[in-house]
């Protein structure tokens, strides 16, 4: 297709990860242009003939869209004019992983940037006191992970201690036969201590903390995507 602008514009993408079975976002920004009708956004995927998505003249144009993305993509149309070319992706699949190109053309010029999109499954862990066990134990559960993660325990009091001998971790395949439920039990825990259950694969790292005292149980959990950024 013809290029209207002679200059190159800055296009920025962010490496991101998609959680299978959920909405995902392929992030891309560019130098804003108030002339919406002059903006063309094209998303391409390496190894795929046809487009992932195209937005031009103020609306979506799916005439060249590859079938695997039909009905699964949309730009944030009201944010295009301020330089947001990010793509919303419905029902992320493992096969959506790969290298994508965000190509932009405006009245100011043109530009493009690549991004690596990883797909897998990751979820927040929840730690509970396991009163069923013969000795006081902690049970760390996270419903959906893929690929299979590693699980490690740590404690505030015994920093640097190796808990692999006093913990037991299992992975149970979920009903869709891809993701797995992670369950890890830590035995012989002591009161007035903070324990952390850390779950990690090449996409995400999640940590669940629990503090058990005589009077209360405090919990906190966080999830961090790895290698996210420009």
């Amino acid at each position: 297709f013809g290029i209207s602008g002679k200059h190159f514009i800055t296009v920025t993408t962010f490496t991101s990860a998609g959680n299978i079975g959920e909405d995902g976002t392929l992030s891309c920004t560019f130098e804003p242009d108030i002339k919406l009708n002059g903006i063309v956004i094209q998303w391409l995927k390496e190894g795929i003939k046809g487009l992932v998505h195209e937005f031009k003249e103020g609306k979506d144009d799916l005439s060249q869209q590859h079938e695997m993305f039909r009905g699964r993509t949309a730009v944030f149309a009201d944010q295009v004019v301020v330089g947001n070319a990010s793509l919303r992706l419905k029902n992320v699949q493992l096969t959506d992983a790969g290298t994508y190109t965000c190509y932009i053309r405006t009245s100011k010029g043109k530009g493009n940037a690549n991004l690596e999109y990883k797909t897998g499954a990751f979820s927040m862990p929840e730690i509970n006191v396991d009163y069923n066990a013969s000795s006081e134990s902690l049970r760390c559960e996270a419903p959906r992970w893929f690929p299979q993660p590693t699980v490690a325990w740590a404690s505030q009091v015994d920093q640097g201690a190796n808990f692999s001998e006093v913990s037991n971790t299992s992975f149970e395949l979920n009903s869709e036969n891809v993701t797995m439920k992670v369950v890890s039990v830590l035995y012989n825990v002591t009161i007035n201590n903070t324990y952390s259950c850390m779950i990690e694969n090449d996409i995400a790292k999640a940590t669940g903390d629990i503090k058990v005292t005589d009077s209360e149980v405090k919990r906190r959990s966080q999830l961090q995507l790895l290698n996210s950024g420009p």
Epitope: G21, E22, G71, T73, K90
Partner: antibody, heavy 121, light 107 residues
Framework: EVQLVQSGAEVKKPGASVKVSCKAS????????IGWVRQAPGQGLEWIGD????????NYNEKFKGRATITRDTSTSTAYLELSSLRSEDTAVYYC??????????????WGQGTLVTVSS | DIQMTQSPSSLSASVGDRVTITCKAS??????VAWYQQKPGKAPKLLIY???TLQPGVPSRFSGSGSGRDYTLTISSLQPEDFATYYC?????????FGQGTKVEIK
Amino acid sequence: EVQLVQSGAEVKKPGASVKVSCKASGYTFTSYWIGWVRQAPGQGLEWIGDIYPGGGYTNYNEKFKGRATITRDTSTSTAYLELSSLRSEDTAVYYCARLDGSSYRGAMDSWGQGTLVTVSS
Amino acid sequence: DIQMTQSPSSLSASVGDRVTITCKASQGFNKYVAWYQQKPGKAPKLLIYYTSTLQPGVPSRFSGSGSGRDYTLTISSLQPEDFATYYCLQYGNLLYAFGQGTKVEIK
């Protein structure tokens, strides 16, 4: 305000065809999928299929493949459902509905008022 | 294609009751479950989409939850205008599918 206005009630004989229309207003017609759902008397909702007016792409419930045809006329912002080889079990209220999310096929967020199709000899 | 099995098919409740309706997907995992309310002679009304997102204008007594194959619609305190039939919808796959419906009646 999004509005979907459907054509009036129809009475058809078994074996005949019916074409129900759904005129959209209040949004960009070509940017959102439109779905069709039916409801037989006293029964639940049944998804028939949908269309993306911007390109004419369609999806159909296997049950209706070959008998249902979903089309659109972008010049009048109207979607159509044609059902052929009608039988008494096709007696139902037929609804059109806009799918949320523009080119992303979301849930049905705005509905037409429904069109009663009666199949009787 | 995915089927949605909804239960119960009907229930009787009083104003102020907490009501729970469930839908079980025949396979897979995705968060694309919506809930609709329908009153006699009217078109369905979208209450919740993407498992738990409340449609604008819908009262906060309605909530959705779920993961894996099991999804739930909860009405925390039933109001007189809530007596209706409720449907779940799976819209994550190419082929959409409704549950069979749950009629909520006055006890």
